[in-house]
Structures are given as C-alpha cells and as structure tokens.
C-alpha cells in the first residue's frame, strides 16, 4: 500500500485531515500527549481502520478497548474504507490515560477521498482503475512485469501536413488519439472538497520535452482535446468538480529512447492543500504512473513480408519485372519509387530501414531514415511516412556521414538464445572497422547510440570496413528454415567457390566460362580463375575477414556450424585494398518468405546449367526455399550493389511482445 502523510494529533484542538483511499497514514499520538499520561486508547468511526503495532515485541492487534503504552516503539497507522460523503465525516478519538488524571481526549476528523491516476499498467490494452499503489511507480520487464507503454506519435495522420503528429500540439481526430495512451484520473470527494484543495498534473522538467498530454473533454469530439503538459509546460492545475468524477488524458511520447533518455516518463498528480490563503500550498498526496516509450524494433528476414519497395531507374525494367513477379509470388504489396522521385538513386536498402513500435493497444510500422541523404532522401518522409506509418531519423543531416551509415549496413538476426540469455526479437547487426585509425569508417555514433538505447535487440558490431562499400549485407543474410533454430545464416564464401570450381575443373570443365552472355565483359575460364594467384591471395584475405565475422556471429548469436550455409562467392580487392564482389554477390538477396530473389551470378555453364546457381539451389531448396535468379548485372552489380541493396521490405511485426522480454 502506498505511503500517506503523517498526521499529528493534539488534545488542545481537533485535527482535520484528508486520507486518500489506498494509502497508509501514520498517526503521531506521542509528540503532543499530556505529560502525566502513560498510555492511550483509540476509538473510530466505522469507516476507519486503525492498526497499532508495538515494537518490541512486534505484536499487532486491532483496536478495541485495549490501551497501549505511550512510548516511541508504538506505531499507529490508519486506512479508510470508503470516500467521505461530506468533509470530516469520519472520526478518530484518542484517549490518553495516566495514573492520577482522568482521560484526556484528542479528536481527529478525517475526510476520505479517492484520487487515482490509472493507465494500462497491466498491458492488456485496457485501462483499469487502480488505487494508489506502489507498483505504478516502477516499470518492470517480463511476462509478470507491469507499467504502462507510450508510443512516439511519429506518424502523419493528416495527409495535408508535412510534419509528424507529435510535432504539433493538436489532436487531429480519433485516429490520432489511437496513437496515444489513455490515462484516467479518478476522483471521489465531498462536493466542496476542491474549494480547499487543488490537483496538479506534472512531469519532471528533464522529461517535459519527451511527452505531451492532452486532456479530453468527456463525451465531446476529440478536437476538444487540449494540451495540458508538454515541452513548454511541465505542470497544469486541474479543474475538478467534487463528487465522483473521471477525467481522461491522452499521452503521446515525443522522443524515442536514446543516449540521454532511458525511455521512462513519470506523470504525477499532486493534491495540494490550499485552504489557508495566507500560507503556501502544501502537498498532501501524490499518485504517479510510469510509462516506458516503446522502442523501435527491426524485423528479420524470417518475418513474413508485407510490402516491397524498389526504384524505377533508367534501363532497369527487367529487374523491376523480376522483383514484381517475386512480390506477387510472396503475396506482397509492391511500391515502386519513380525516377523523378529517386533522383537516380537506386539504393532503396541504404536509404531506410522499416521496423515498428508497439503498445498493447496499437502497433505502428516506423521507417528509420538513414542520414546518407542522397537522391532518395525525400522518399521516407514524403512517401513512406503517413497515416499509421511512423518516421524516425538520427545522425547528422548534412555531411559527416560515411558509407557505413547506410542501412545496407544495418541488419537484424532472427530470435536467438545464447547460453541462458534469450533474444526473442533477435539482435541488431551492423558493420564497423576492426580498430579506429585515420581512415577507418564506422557507423555514426548517434546511430549506434539510438540502436543500443532501444534495449530489446542488443546490437552486435561486425567487421565490414574491409569492403569498398562496407555493408554487412555484402557478406551475410538470413533465410527461414523449417528446422533447428528456424533459420540459417548465409555467409559469402570464397573457399566454397574455389572448392566448387576445382571440382568442375577436375571433371573436365576447366574451359567453362564465367560471365557468359554478358556483353563487353571479359569472360573468364574456370582454369584461369583457379590459376590466378593474385585473385587467390585477395580471396584468402576476404575469407579471413568473413571468418572473423563467422566466429563473432557464432558467439553472439549462439550458432553452431550447422546453422550456417556457405554461399560460393569470389571477391576482388580494388582501390585502397577494399573488397568488392567479383561476380554478382549471391548472398545479397531479397528474402520474401520462402521466395528468394538472388543476384544471377553468370557462373560457368556446365551441362546447360550455371554451376553457381545449381550449387546454391542444392543448398537452399532442401529448406523449402524457392530460388529465383535475377539479372542485376548492369543496373546494380557494376555499380557496387545487388538485389538486396536495391530493394526494401516491410515485414509483419513479431507476435512476441517486447515488454515480455528481460533485456
């Protein structure tokens, strides 16, 4: 039970006090007791429960005709059963006894009131009235945890507007209200109670810029909502009528968890005694609700796809046809960004990452806009954000970004268990340098901080700076699987490619050509590739880089070798000793459920079939996956990217609720 105030009683004059239902009020009977009295007894009205404990020994008994010694070891507490109909309608009488004097009486007139701030602390999607209880002041994780949840109101329900809903202090309509969390103030008091008392709703100054609270006028249109707390206003005096009354508030978060904001927001209602005009107002009681701002959550390839995004650029019609067909097979919506909007920037994966936020009453997809800000920079904010589709961005919006700040360098694993530690929403993966140096590249600290602060998908730093472009999607992917952990990790593997080519040479296919059918491209014989010592050295280096990541992923995701599939792939070291795919990088694939859009490798044709395609199909088809090889050679591959780089996917949110995990 929540702690109430301390009431001091005195025989000189009656004491008047307020007792809030659900709180435990301490009664000081000793400090004003007559000098020659040695004990006391208590009588109460039926609506008051008094408990007396004497320590030592800590015997506790309900009051009756018993008398109790007047000494510091006595603790008297009281609670009230119901709200008062009128001021001071409940009475407590303390009788002081002494050996030589008649009993001396002290009177306490109590007014019982119900003041309670409620929110969905049980995370059921409904607000249940709660009396003042300690639990509301703490937010706990896990299936048995409690505490309310706020969404950042980062969508744009008004198509006419260019701003997010949380950027204004108006409620657009009932749709906008659904993005907010309901909080109810319940009061039950005597009719005249608020002539002598005031309620103030407030938030800490350190949190005021992270939240906005609207007060709803009951039974009226949502447009009647008005801001009572927010970035410019940390407190608000409430006009509350006496009697039984409920007041609804709608709460929206304005900021995601981040470095200097753990995501917790406490809203408090304080009851002030304003009965003595000549004295300052005194706090009589406080009730608080703690909210946690819902984190931004990424979705892995194992989640069902719902929408595919791709750019239309000069001469990529065939690529578009292939992606369209794949999206249709996977029953996905397809969104094509036209040339006039993408400004010749085809790298849809690099511009944004689509995740979601979730509260018990609402789930919202949210696009995370990367700071790379090239031709597609307007696309997330102008075309993706909208009604029930949120937006967030981090990092410098002008300059100061590296290639590692593009979101081809941001992936997430499927759910994993590492030892005793569960990651039911998977772990974020991003690429970094091995160590900082004058020319090393890393993801901008603001992005790293944001990702870590979400707490629910603890990030893993991989090593990707060895690549020219430097993105993790150039050497890894995940595909769904029916067995084991429910997925496989795919890793690009020069070793596997050399093994395949060696086998083909041993079988007499050394003259088979790589890049057959590619105009203006030097076709390479298997035997020439195998005998090129420089290329071997380059791939030996690449293999070491990928193996470093392999061990890191095994350790951080709790994987065994049998959870990994090696995809044959060769690389070449280009300027500044950075690696690029030698032929289209098959691991850079689009995963739409069981349908995979894989860059067509243009490998050696043996017995009428590309041996690279055949090998990949033999590895993936047993998992129930369907491989479609997409020609991206001229439009993507020679521009240092592939199918995954050129596409993006909105996926179904996890059925697992983030608040049920323990980070």
């Amino acid at each position: 039970m929540a702690q109430g105030t301390l009431i001091r009683v005195t025989p000189e004059q009656p004491t008047h006090a307020v007792c809030v239902l659900g709180t435990l009020t301490q009664l000081d009977v000793c400090s004003s007791a007559p000098e020659d009295c040695t004990s006391f007894s208590v009588n109460t009205s039926p609506g008051v429960v008094v408990d007396i404990a004497h320590s030592p020994p800590a015997k506790k008994k309900s009051t009756g005709s018993s008398t109790w010694p007047l000494d510091p070891g006595v603790e008297v507490t009281l609670t009230m059963k119901a709200a008062s109909g009128s001021t001071g309608d409940q009475k407590v009488q303390i009788s002081y006894h002494g050996p030589k004097t008649p009993p001396v009486k002290a009177l306490l007139y109590l007014t019982g009131v119900e003041i309670s701030l409620s929110a969905d602390i049980t995370r059921t999607g409904k607000v249940k009235p709660t009396r003042a209880v300690e639990d509301k002041r703490t937010w706990t994780w896990g299936p048995c945890g409690q505490g309310a949840i706020l969404l950042v109101n980062c969508d744009r329900d008004n198509p006419e507007s260019s701003a997010m809903d949380c950027e204004d202090d108006e409620v657009l309509d009932s749709k906008d209200l659904k993005d907010m969390s309901l909080m109810t103030l319940s009061t039950k008091t005597p009719q005249d109670f608020f002539t002598r008392h005031t309620l103030v709703l407030h938030v800490a100054r350190s949190e005021m810029d992270k939240v906005r609270v609207f007060q709803a006028t009951r039974g009226r249109l949502s447009s009647r909502c008005r801001v009572v707390l927010g970035p410019k206003q940390p407190s608000h005096y409430l006009m509350v009528p006496g009697g039984k009354h409920n007041m609804d508030f709608y709460v929206e978060a304005l900021a995601f968890p981040d470095t200097n904001f753990p995501g917790l927001i406490t809203l408090t209602v304080s009851m002030l005694d304003t009965s003595k005009l000549e004295l300052p107002e005194a706090v009589v009681f406080q009730d608080s609700v703690v909210f946690r701002v819902a984190p931004w959550i990424m979705t892995p390839n194992t989640q069902p796809p719902q929408e595919v995004y791709v750019c239309s650029i000069f001469e990529n019609e065939d690529f578009l046809k292939s992606v369209t067909a794949l999206a249709m097979q996977a029953r996905c919506k397809l969104t094509i960004c036209p040339e006039e909007e993408n400004m010749d920037d085809q790298w849809m994966q690099d511009e944004m990452e689509i995740g979601y936020i979730q509260a018990p009453h609402k789930t919202l997809p949210v696009v995370f806009d990367s700071p790379r800000n090239r031709g597609l920079k307007e696309f997330p904010i102008k075309r993706v954000m909208g009604p029930d589709f949120g937006y967030v961005t981090r990092g410098p919006q002008t300059g100061g970004v590296s290639g590692l700040d593009s979101f081809g360098n941001l992936e997430v694993s499927p759910p994993v268990t590492v030892g005793d530690k569960e990651y039911p929403l998977g772990r974020i993966l991003f690429g970094d340098s091995c160590y900082p140096s004058s020319d090393s590249r890393e993801m901008h600290q603001a992005l790293q901080d944001f990702l870590s602060a979400q707490q629910v998908q603890a990030p893993v730093k991989l090593y990707s700076d060895w690549l020219t472009v430097g993105h993790v999607d150039e050497f890894l992917s995940f595909v769904p699987a029916p067995d084991r952990k429910g997925f496989r990790l795919l890793l690009a593997s020069p070793r596997s490619c050399y093994k395949l080519f060696q086998e083909q040479q041993n079988e007499g296919h050394g003259d088979a050509l790589l890049f057959q059918g590619i105009k203006k491209k030097n076709q390479q014989k298997i035997k020439n590739i195998l005998s090129n010592t420089t290329l071997r050295e380059h791939n030996s280096f690449v293999e070491r880089c990928i193996d470093w990541n392999r061990e890191l992923l095994k350790r951080e995701l709790g994987l065994a070798e049998s959870d990994i599939i090696d995809i044959p792939q060769l690389f070449k070291l280009k300027e500044f000793s950075k690696a690029e795919a030698f032929f289209p990088n098959m691991v850079n694939m689009l995963v739409l459920g069981k349908h995979l859009g894989i860059p067509k490798p243009f490998g050696p044709i043996i017995n009428g079939r590309c041996c690279l395609e055949e090998k990949v199909c033999s590895l993936l088809e047993p998992l129930g996956l369907h491989c479609t090889f997409i020609n991206d050679f001229y439009t993507y591959h020679i521009r240092h990217g592939e199918v995954h780089c050129g596409t993006n996917v909105r996926r179904k949110p996890f059925s697992f609720k983030w608040w049920n995990m323990v980070p």
């Epitope: 090239r374 590296s402 290639g403 140096s437 004058s438 020319d439 020219t468 472009v469 430097g470 203006k520 491209k521 030097n522 390479q524 590739i529 090129n532 420089t534 290329l535 380059h538 070449k572 070291l573 280009k574 300027e575 500044f576 000793s577 950075k578 030698f582 020679i638 521009r639 240092h640 990217g641």
Partner: antibody
Amino acid sequence: QVQLVESGGGLVKPGGSLRLSCAASGSTLSDYFVSWIRQAPGKGLEWVSFINTANTFTYYADSVRGRFTISRDNAKNTVYLQMNSLRAEDTAVYYCSSANDDVDDIVAPGRGYYMDVWGRGTLVTVSS
Amino acid sequence: QSALTQPRSVSGSPGQSVTISCTGTRGDVGRYNHVSWYQQHPGKAPKLIIYNVYERPSGVPDRFSGSKSGNTASLTISGLQAEDEADYYCSSHSRSSTPVLFGGGTKLTVL
C-alpha cells in the same frame, strides 16, 4: 572521354572555408574515380583526396584529413571539395582528375591511384 | 620534403635518351605496381604518360617507357625532342595513411 572543369577558387582568410567544384562533361561521373591534387606555387604535386563516385568511398591525405570533405552529386555530374579551417600552406592550384573504373579487370587495376584526365585547375589563396 | 625521391633536374640533347629515377620504400614503390608518371609543361595541367609501372595510355609515343627494380622506378625517354622539355613527376600507391604519394618532380631540359 570525360572533360573536367574546376571552379570555386579564390582568396580566403586563414580559418575560412571554400567549396571547389569539379564539373564533368562528355561522360557520366558515376563510372569514374575522381581525385583532387594540388600544386603550391613553384612546388610539386600533392595528392589531396579521392572519391569512388559509384559508391562514395572516400580517402584523404594526412595533411587535410578532418578539414576537407570530398563529395559528389551524380545528378549534377559534379564532385566537390569542401575546404574548412584553411591555412596559408593550403595555398595552391587545385586540380580535379579522374580515371575510369574498369569493372572488367579481374583484379585491382590501380585505377584509383593514377589520373588520366585532368582539369585546368583553380587557384586557392589563403592569406590575411 | 617529398615522399618519393627524384633528381631535381636532368638534361639531354635531341635524339638522346634520358632516364629519370624515382626512389621510394618497401611500403610504396617496392610493394605495388601502381607507379605512374606525369608530364607537366609550364602553366599547364599534368598529363599521364605511364601507369602501372610500364603501361602507356593511348596517344603517348612509345619513346616513353617505364620500369621498376626494387624500391626504384624509372622513366626513360628515348629520341629526345624539344617538346619533351617539361617537369616530370612520379607517383605511387603507398600503404601509409596517405595512399598516393608524388615525387618532388624532375625538370628535363632538352639542350
């Protein structure tokens, strides 16, 4: 063959900033590596910065790292050199140069390390 | 102080051959075959005449040839002509934190 024209040079005080532009014509810049090279009056050539215009991979000389930023706008077929915190020793003619990125090479051809097309240069003078 | 060392000047008569040396270290000229040579006439932009140690861009006369031995690269101009009078710079990829180094330049005078 691509042609390059530099602009944006001029007189600037120490600590000041300038942005040089290198506009390409005759070919699309996204197929090229572009470098900036400078030459102080009466002195030799000094390599300053590099960008792979296809994927914005960048590199800098020790003498300018942290002060200069190379970038590109493929839609405008232009590469930029943003020069901040300029010093007297940055006074030079700044040349923009390029090399075609030949994707056909089986292994690194080193095209990012040499410059087969040069602009005429633009003079930057840093003086109080 | 340039990272690659070239003689300040060389000279030769028309029709003769001259060789300009460019000495680096095991971390640049000695390690990589990414050595190039540039010709610069006064008031003009440099022009690439040799790349990847010995390769000539199209349009460059075969009188210009390049070679490398250990940490030293060389440019040889045979059958000297008056228009060859210019400054010549060598350049190499380097494993240092400045990845492209130039020599201090050599002034070629055709007597």
